[in-house]
């Protein structure tokens, strides 16, 4: 059962001091969705018992496993049903506390009634303030039964519920006709799903025989122990003032558990702590009584004394619940109350016993839940005990349940029951998930949903190339971490499977389903270098590069050119999609900008090493284009160009540049400088006869300006082929004429 306790502080003289605390002993309880499960919830349940609205109650979380409800302002705030919900997933459990007003007309003799299926439950409401009118019983808020006020027996109204079934469970109330619901007696009826001493589907399994008022859970056969007791059968008392499944919690305050009501998961319900009784749990047990609600009687023999918290304290030489067993009677020693094994394992179980006469191997036997008796295969005899070792046949799920070690000698016999949990090794329900991939490694998330039982102790990842018959490679990893599979082959499919293990021998589960994960292309390894670059304008740059010569095919799909503008913090990337390319024209750059330039080879999505960077300064943007450019053929080898100066110049022109290109020609254009910027005319000489040329020009101040319009003109015919065009300005021409 889930280790969950709801504590109610019953100091009722002052409602403002009243509080409810829910304590969970579960690992990771209450930490919320960022840990193992949902948080603890503690709330008033107004579905059945509705009380007048008041100020909202205050919820305070104390650490990860405790939550407290305060802020009750008046006694009526306390009346009704409170619930605490804790545990995760299928273990999510609700613990319920029912609070009665001490000033009600009717009071319950006992609030919580736990009964077995088929039993007769009797709810008893004691008359506290008499009214001569009908008493109405309700079940979960709906009409159930009516009693005439004359039907009271010894000042009590009884509701008999014969042959109860689990659906009969719930909140019952007894109210006088015309009285406030807050004056009702409220009860909680818990009906176990099985008859007395039975549990499991079909109620075929036998309960372990819970001691000290523990109640056998009808689903899992575990004993839900009263507060202050622990062990598989609640056989062990906690120290005074302690509670919880392992006695790990301590009652608050100097008076220990006095004045506290403890509510535990069904089918236990609520009671006072061990050693206390009364409607407010403030009365110590009467002599000879002990345990929760002082319901147990000591009946100590052989000089044992009764302790109201733990029961009989035996003198030397005696043991047993009532000190009825002589130490000469054999006794099972230090038997674990719970053992866990994995399915299909063949564990060894040890059982030690002492006594006089001394137990021997044949006097100790082990009984399985199905009644099969195992005899020990060997025994270790020591001066103070005999330890019998049992080799258990291969375990099946049906072996889960209560086993019993029994020792019999002529001095008597003793037996100890213990719970065996057969766990199913975990099997992944899904394939692992690929997170990232490179050419020689895959990063994988291995932990997936699984069938079977946790916790997961180790995760093994098995992998090998797809369609390979070679042995699987295996890597063992921490369950909470991602795995990197290294030293793989590039561009290769790998079959990857997960195997999960839980603690203990035989905890390895079957392999999960395979998935195909493919490594990336190989990384390009060649480092290019920049051969050179030249500025083709204020916003254009032509770049060229080279690669080292290596044998074999080139590993690469193309090149990536990167220009970094440090001033503006901007990067420009240019993709050259041919691995054969060794030059590229970069356009649309920012004039007057200092760029850092590099180039790298890429393959698939992977980049090779970058070239050593170059630093390039683009000239600032130049002046506007010259206007009204005009060309006029003068001879078979000369053409005259005329133009007008650009408008709105930012400064004095340092020169003009003329571009000359044969129309339709494939060669590079020729640039000719006109170094006398005041001129508006020049003659281009050395041209070929009968040839059509294209001309355009631009001015330069600090940087080159925009190109003018392009003009076409043909030289005159019948000339010889010239060496090539040259330029002569008008001023020079005039000089020659003189």
């Amino acid at each position: 059962a889930v280790d969950l306790t709801l504590l109610a502080n019953l100091r009722l003289t002052d409602p403002q001091r009243f509080f409810l605390t829910c304590v969970s002993g579960e690992a990771g309880a209450g930490r919320g969705s960022d840990a193992w499960g949902p948080p603890l919830l503690l709330e008033k349940d107004d579905r059945i018992v509705r009380t007048p609205p008041g100020p909202p109650l205050r919820l305070a979380r104390n650490g990860s496993h405790q939550v407290t409800l305060r802020g009750f302002s008046k006694p009526s705030d306390l009346v009704g049903v409170f619930s605490c919900v804790g545990g995760a997933g299928a273990r999510r459990t609700r613990v319920i506390y029912v609070h009665n007003s001490p000033g009600a007309h009717l009071l319950p003799d006992k609030v919580t009634h736990t009964v077995n299926k088929g039993d007769t439950a009797v709810l008893s409401a004691r008359v506290h303030k008499e009214k001569q009118t009908d008493v109405i019983w309700k079940s979960n808020g709906s009409y159930f039964y009516t009693l005439d006020w004359h039907e009271a027996q010894d000042g009590r109204f009884l509701l008999q519920l014969p042959n109860v079934q689990p659906p009969s469970s719930g909140i019952y109330s007894a109210t006088y006709l015309e009285a406030s619901p807050l004056g009702s007696a409220f009860f909680r009826l818990i009906v176990r799903g099985c008859g007395a001493g039975r549990w499991g589907p079909g109620c075929t399994k036998e309960c372990p025989g819970c001691l000290h008022g523990g109640v056998c859970h009808d689903h899992d056969g575990e004993c839900v122990c009263p507060p202050g007791f622990t062990g598989t059968r609640c056989e062990q008392a906690c120290r005074e003032g302690r509670f919880g499944q392992s006695c790990q919690e301590q009652c608050p305050g100097i008076s220990g558990c006095r004045g506290l009501t403890f509510c535990l998961p069904d089918p236990y319900g609520c009671s006072c702590g061990s050693g206390w009784r009364g409607s407010q749990c403030q009365e110590a047990c009467a002599p000879g009584h002990f345990g929760a609600d002082c319901r147990l009687q000591c009946q100590c023999q052989n000089g044992g004394t009764c302790d109201r918290f733990s029961g009989c304290v035996c003198p030397s030489g005696w043991h047993g619940v009532h000190c009825e067993k002589s130490d000469r009677i054999p006794q099972i020693l230090n038997m674990a109350s719970e053992l866990e094994f994995n399915l299909e394992t063949m564990p060894r179980i040890n059982c030690a016993a002492a006594g006089n006469p001394f137990p021997v191997r044949g006097s100790i036997e082990l009984r399985k839940p199905d009644g099969t008796v195992l005899l020990s295969t060997k025994a270790i005899v020591e001066p103070e005990k005999t330890t019998a070792e049992f080799e258990v046949p291969r375990l099946v799920l049906a072996d889960s349940g209560f086993w019993e070690c029994r020792v019999s000698t002529s001095g008597g016999q003793d037996s100890r029951r213990f719970k065996v949990n057969v766990k199913v090794p975990p099997v992944p329900l899904a394939a692992p998930r690929l997170l990232t991939k490179q050419s020689r490694q895959l990063v994988v998330s291995p932990l997936v949903s699984f069938s079977g039982d946790g916790p997961i102790s180790t995760v093994r990842l098995h992998y090998r190339p797809q369609d390979s018959t070679m042995d699987w490679s295996t890597i063992v990893v921490d369950p909470s971490e991602n795995v990197t599979l290294m030293n793989l082959r590039p561009k290769t499919g790998y079959s990857v499977r997960v195997q999960l293990s839980r603690p203990g021998e035989g905890g390895e589960g079957a392999w999960g389903p395979p998935t195909l994960m493919t490594t990336d292309c190989p990384e390009p390894l060649l480092q290019p270098w920049l051969e050179g670059w030249h500025v083709e304008g204020t916003d254009r740059l032509r770049v060229s590069w080279s690669l080292p010569l290596v044998p074999g095919p080139l590993v690469g799909d193309g090149f990536l050119l990167r220009l970094w503008d440090g001033t503006r913090g901007q990067e420009r990337r240019e993709n050259v999609s041919s691995p054969q390319a060794r030059t590229a024209l970069l356009t649309g750059l920012t004039p007057g900008t200092h760029y850092q330039l590099d180039v790298q080879l890429y393959h698939c999505t992977l980049l090779g090493p970058a070239s050593p960077p170059a630093h390039v300064l683009l000239p600032p943007s130049g002046p506007p284009a010259p206007r009204h450019l005009h060309a006029q053929a003068l001879s078979d080898s000369e053409i005259q160009l005329t133009w007008k100066h650009p408008e709105a110049l930012p400064g004095p022109i340092s020169k003009y540049v003329v571009e000359v290109q044969v129309a339709g020609g494939a060669g590079d254009p020729l640039w000719i400088d006109v170094d006398r910027p005041e001129e508006t005319s020049t003659i281009i000489r050395g041209l070929n006869a009968s040839t059509r040329y294209l001309f355009r020009m631009r001015a330069s101040i600090q940087g080159l300006g925009d190109w003018s319009n392009t003009v076409e003109e043909s030289t005159l015919g019948n000339g010889l082929q010239a060496e090539g065009p040259v330029q002569e300005s008008r001023a020079a021409e005039e000089g020659l004429d003189q």
Epitope: Y145, T146, L147, H150, E151
Partner: antibody, heavy 118, light 110 residues
């Protein structure tokens, strides 16, 4: 569906006896108070008697006290009215009804006619 | 045990509202909030229309409403319909755990 079916009515001489039955179905009979209400021909309704679920408490109208006895058999889901020393003024249609807390009758039978005449 | 006093008859036109009174004592009507009203058509069994002074069972038209002041309870039928023509009886729980019924009122829709 809740159903109440009265039977046992008929003609009886003054001073005679008659036992009425009411068979209940469609609800947990043993949990409810049950009552008899009568209506003389052309007259109004008159409450006659009530019995508590356990049968441990019964109440009667003054007009029938000492002559009529209400009883129930929870194992048979049946309500009874034993009528002795009948008088002409007991002539009426007798209805059986289920009583809810606070004394209202939420389900009624169709009634059975008792005629007391010589 | 005395009966509760009701008017012998009340009439109204379709669409009108009518009110029927029911007078008792402090031991019945005045002492408890347990007054109920029943409708009875000729030859039929009674049917509960109002319980606990003013509560309507499911299936009963909201044209029927109940109230109480002192020792007198009232049933109001608003938007009178021809089908409302019937006998109406009040009933009360008493301090002696018994029941008392009214004299009955014939409602006529004119």
């Amino acid at each position: 569906e809740v159903q109440l079916l009265e039977s046992g009515g008929g003609l009886v001489q003054p001073g005679g006896s008659l036992r009425l039955s009411c068979a209940a179905s469609g609800f947990t009979f043993s949990h409810y108070k049950m009552a008899w209400v009568r209506q003389a021909p052309g007259k109004g309704l008159e409450w006659v008697s009530v019995i508590y679920p356990s049968g441990g408490a019964t109440y009667y109208a003054d007009s029938v006290k000492g002559r009529f006895t209400i009883s129930r058999d929870n194992s048979k889901n049946t309500l009874y009215l034993q009528m002795n020393s009948l008088r002409a003024e007991d002539t009426a249609v007798y209805y059986c009804a289920r009583a809810l807390p606070g004394g209202y009758f939420d389900y009624w039978g169709q009634g059975t006619l008792v005629t007391v005449s010589s | 045990q005395s009966v509760l006093t009701q008017p012998a008859s009340v009439s109204g036109s379709p669409g009108q509202s009518i009110t029927i009174s029911c007078t008792g004592t402090s031991s019945d009507v005045g002492g408890y909030n347990y007054v109920s009203w029943y409708q009875q058509h000729p030859g039929k069994a009674p049917k509960v229309m109002i319980y606990d002074v003013s509560n309507r069972p499911s299936g009963v038209s909201n044209r029927f409403s109940g109230s109480k002041s002192g020792n007198t309870a009232s049933l109001t039928i608003s938007g009178l319909l021809a089908e409302d023509e019937a006998d109406y009886y009040c009933s009360s729980y008493t301090s002696t755990a018994t029941y008392v019924l009214g004299t009955g009122t014939r409602v006529t829709v004119v």
